[in-house]
């Protein structure tokens, strides 16, 4: 077993963070299924808790989890906010990884909880920056319940903390009111106030009246040392929001809702994108939602609440990321029917749509891409790439993650590394060879559909432009002529303007391909051939010696030749010539030109002299020659008989 990943987790204060494969990634030399890589929590976290997304609120500490659950993002660390402010805190988890029969591996996961980090769940870097609600034309104290930089002070070691303060410098003043410290207005010449003044209740905002538009101020907060000296340490620039409450109550206005998209069996927070209202005179905690009707694909839950579904929650729960949707195994979309009220206006109906994404998609590869040899290119179709999940995914998009080695993909005639299912279905995605040295290729794509991805490899083969003989059996022990009636790449020759050539890759198991001397005057016997051309076939220079299977009585059998066919300007292609053989039967008409027949047959005919050392054909076999072969075979005899 081996452990990879950073083994460090950075968490925003008070938030939930999933463990990921970047953090914790186990593997085994045996390639064990991630579901069988088991972690045991030896010592749990001190500053929060570890829980499973689907059993989050049981209150029981998580004891075991698998690598597969980490990959799925189901193992969550929740930081629990302490009562005492802090700037940075460190937590550890001690884990034991096991997957018998391998030896256990101990691991420590370090957790850093820091206000330094940029946190989407918590836009402020301060202990508190909650904003202020003030009635129109009135004044309100800004207390430490609304604005508190104690966490900046917490970065200073406690013995020196009393000598330090936090200086707030106002960089943009309120536009509809005034800030006062000890009843003295702040202005460009005196833009500062201190955390200690805030703590003493000396900071006040006075609204100038004339409407309930939002107000606020921007500030920079940093540590101040003894005697007002600036010291190195954490600092932040933020805005403090001031909401002016209308004395005349107005009903909340629901905002347009974006459906929640979630994979089945998982958990996702509900955000303001799904549920939000505009209500200038109600605080988020005053906006209450009630579930009137829930869908069957899951339920709403509150972090820190009970294990079951919640039926009541507030806008503050949504804004803080505490409200989550827990999906069950259903793949059907659903809608929550809700009612919403600020407590002073009649309830308003609202809805929350939940779209269930597939937990996984699959790229279906029904066949390799076959490229016609003379064209050197072919369009992809659904046979090569089609995405399915719990339904077909016509909206799938593909991205090349490893390109083909001997060609490229084109969309609309130009090289492209990304394309859609629609472009495939319309025949716009083409693979074309650019390097004509291989008869096959492959590329890897990443498919993306409904937020989920999967990868697949598309194999490419070249279909030879070759006409191959497909007739009856050939006689064992005979030599037959290999000519265009058996193998013909003439069309490839015409299409490429070149002489195709063949390379013997494999076979036959019983027999061999030989070059036949043109005449008796040519020296030597039959030469073994590994390469030949279309011209050789047309010239009748080649023979196939059909062997007998060794070590058994003569009987019909199958054999084959595997060839690679090359021509100029096109990719090579592999083709095979499959044929059946049988013991030679002198009475049978063979539909191929026989250059020689088995020795025994000649001896029986009383003509031993016909077996020539040059491999020249002996007298015509007693088998009648069919018309198809007569021209070739008799022509061969006539051309050579008197040479």
């Amino acid at each position: 077993l081996s452990l990879e990943g950073s083994r460090t987790l950075t968490v925003c204060p008070g938030s939930v963070q999933p463990l990921s494969s970047q953090t914790l990634r186990a593997s085994s030399s045996a390639g064990t299924d991630p579901q069988l890589l088991l972690y045991r929590v030896v010592r749990g976290p001190q500053l929060g808790r570890l829980f499973h997304a689907q059993q989050d609120s049981t209150g029981e500490a998580l004891v075991n989890f698998t690598q597969a659950e980490v990959y799925a993002g189901n193992i969550l660390y929740e930081h629990e906010m302490p009562t005492e402010p802090f700037w940075e805190a460190h937590d550890t988890l001690e884990l034991q990884l096991s997957s018998p029969p391998a030896r256990d591996v101990a691991a420590t996961l370090a957790v850093a909880v820091s206000f330094e980090a940029a946190c989407p769940q918590r836009p402020s870097h301060l202990w508190k920056n909650k904003g202020l609600w003030v009635p129109e034309g009135q004044r309100a104290k800004i207390t430490m319940a609304a604005l508190d930089a104690s966490n900046l002070l917490a970065s200073v070691p406690s013995p020196q903390r009393l000598e330090h303060d936090v200086l707030f410098q106002v960089t943009q003043f309120p536009s509809r009111g005034q800030l006062l410290v000890s009843e003295e207005p702040l202005h460009a010449g005196q833009p500062h106030f201190l955390q200690s003044q805030l703590a003493a209740g000396q900071l006040v905002y006075a609204h100038g009246g004339g409407g309930t538009q939002q107000d606020g101020f921007h500030f920079r907060a940093h540590l101040q040392g003894p005697a007002g000296a600036t010291v190195a340490g954490p600092q932040t620039s933020e805005a403090f929001a001031i909401t002016v409450r209308d004395v005349n109550e107005r009903p909340p206005q629901p905002q347009a809702s974006v459906p929640l998209r979630i994979t089945r069996g998982s958990r996702a927070p509900i955000s303001r994108a799904q549920l939000s209202v505009v209500d200038p005179d109600s605080a988020p905690g005053e906006i209450e939602y009630e579930v009137q009707r829930a869908p069957h694909n899951g339920f709403l839950s509150l972090v820190g609440g009970g294990p079951g579904p919640v039926t009541h929650f507030t806008q503050a729960d949504v804004d803080s990321g505490r409200l989550a949707f827990v999906a069950n195994g259903s793949s059907v979309a659903g809608v929550f029917q809700l009612s919403m009220s600020d407590g002073a206006s009649p309830p308003l109906p609202m809805s929350l749509a939940v779209d269930i994404l597939p937990s996984a998609i699959e790229v279906q590869l029904q066949a390799p891409l076959e490229v016609p040899q003379a064209l050197g290119r072919s369009s992809l179709s659904q046979q090569q790439l089609r995405v399915v999940s719990d339904r077909e995914e016509p909206e799938a998009a593909y991205r090349l993650i490893q390109g083909p080695k001997y060609g490229h993909l084109l969309v609309g005639g130009r090289p492209a590394s990304a394309f859609s299912q629609l472009q495939i279905d319309q025949g716009e995605v083409v693979f074309a060879f650019t390097n004509f040295s291989s008869s096959h290729d492959h590329f890897r794509v990443l498919a993306l559909a409904r937020g989920v991805n999967a990868s697949a490899v598309v194999n490419i083969t070249v279909r030879a432009l070759l006409h191959v003989w497909a007739g009856g059996p050939w006689p064992q022990g005979a030599t037959l002529r290999l000519d265009p009636t058996i193998l013909d790449a003439g069309e490839l020759a015409n299409r490429t303007g070149s002489v195709p050539h063949f390379r013997l890759l494999e076979g036959p198991r019983h027999g061999r391909v030989v070059r036949v001397p043109r005449a008796r005057t040519e020296p030597g016997g039959s030469q073994l051939v590994e390469q030949f051309t279309q011209q050789d076939l047309e010239d009748g220079r080649l023979g196939l010696e059909v062997g007998r299977p060794e070590g058994r009585a003569p009987s019909p059998t199958g054999d084959s030749l595997t060839l690679e066919l090359w021509a100029q300007g096109v990719p090579p292609a592999v083709a095979s010539l499959d044929f059946a053989t049988e013991p030679y039967n002198a009475a049978r008409p063979y539909s191929v030109a026989l250059l020689s027949v088995p020795e025994a047959t000649r001896m029986e005919a009383g003509k031993p002299e016909s077996s020539t050392p040059t491999g020249e054909p002996g007298p015509m076999a007693s088998s009648p020659v069919p018309a198809v072969a007569k021209g070739g075979f008799l022509g061969f005899l006539e051309a050579n008989m008197f040479s």
Epitope: A418, T434, T496
Partner: antibody
Framework: QVQLQESGPGLVKPSQTLSLTCTVS?????????WNWIRQHPGKGLEWIGY???????NYNPSLKSRVTISRDTSKNQFSLKLSSVTAADTAVYYC?????WGQGTLVTVSS | DIQMTQSPSSLSASVGDRVTITCRAS??????LNWYQQKPGKAPKLLIY???SLHSGVPSRFSGSGSGTDYTLTISSLQPEDFATYYC?????????FGQGTKVEIK
């Protein structure tokens, strides 16, 4: 739209290595297909040198293959050309291009 | 390598003329042909890709045709800004190769 900008020394001594970098903006070098280097000798036609693809694979013109290396830095969205053992015959304007769009070209003179 | 031969190597024409430039490949290139325009001291600009597809922003007076080994670039009505050198380039087989160029001059 994709923009390409070549950078590198305009003068290289014979037998040394010519090094140029192409910075791509308006698109990622991991998504465009081919990132090519092409050169043009003074008053002459265009000669393709080689390419690097979105997945980092290379191909070079056989006439220059023994001297050429094209590499990339995805973090900077750049790809580079190195041409070793240069001679006066390598004096040319060097372009980087994805074929749809080309850099403005940089003249490299090989001279002692 | 596939050789690309352009003809003519130069031509003189007047504004408003119809101009045709041909490009012949030493073997079939399956329509994988680009046409570029280059002005002195400037980088080439793509006009046409895949034999006949007009690149974005290119005026419709430019058109391309051809198949197999023979391809043509046509400028239906020559404009003053069209006086330049034109190159064809094949991307059917590696190495990519260019034609030697056709210079279009003012008569």
């Amino acid at each position: 739209q994709v923009q390409l900008q070549e950078s590198g020394p305009g003068l290289v001594k014979p037998s040394q290595t010519l090094s140029l970098t192409c910075t791509v903006s308006g698109g990622s070098i991991t998504s465009g297909y081919y990132w090519n280097w092409i050169r043009q000798h003074p008053g002459k036609g265009l000669e393709w040198i080689g390419y690097i693809t979105y997945d980092g694979s290379n191909n070079y013109n056989p006439s220059l293959k023994s001297r050429v290396t094209i590499s990339r830095d995805t973090s900077k969205n750049q790809f580079s050309l190195k041409l070793s053992s240069v001679t006066a015959a390598d004096t040319a304007v060097y372009y980087c291009a994805d074929f749809d769009y080309w850099g403005q070209g940089t003249l490299v003179t090989v001279s002692s | 390598d596939i050789q690309m031969t352009q003809s003519p190597s130069s031509l003189s024409a007047s504004v408003g003329d119809r101009v045709t430039i041909t490009c012949r490949a030493s073997q079939g290139i399956r329509n994988y042909l680009n046409w570029y325009q280059q002005k002195p001291g400037k980088a080439p600009k793509l006009l046409i890709y895949y034999t006949s597809s007009l690149h974005s922003g290119v005026p419709s007076r430019f058109s391309g045709s051809g198949s197999g080994t023979d391809y043509t670039l046509t400028i239906s009505s020559l404009q003053p800004e069209d006086f330049a050198t034109y190159y064809c380039q094949q991307y059917s087989a590696l190495p990519w190769t260019f034609g030697q160029g056709t210079k279009v001059e003012i008569k």
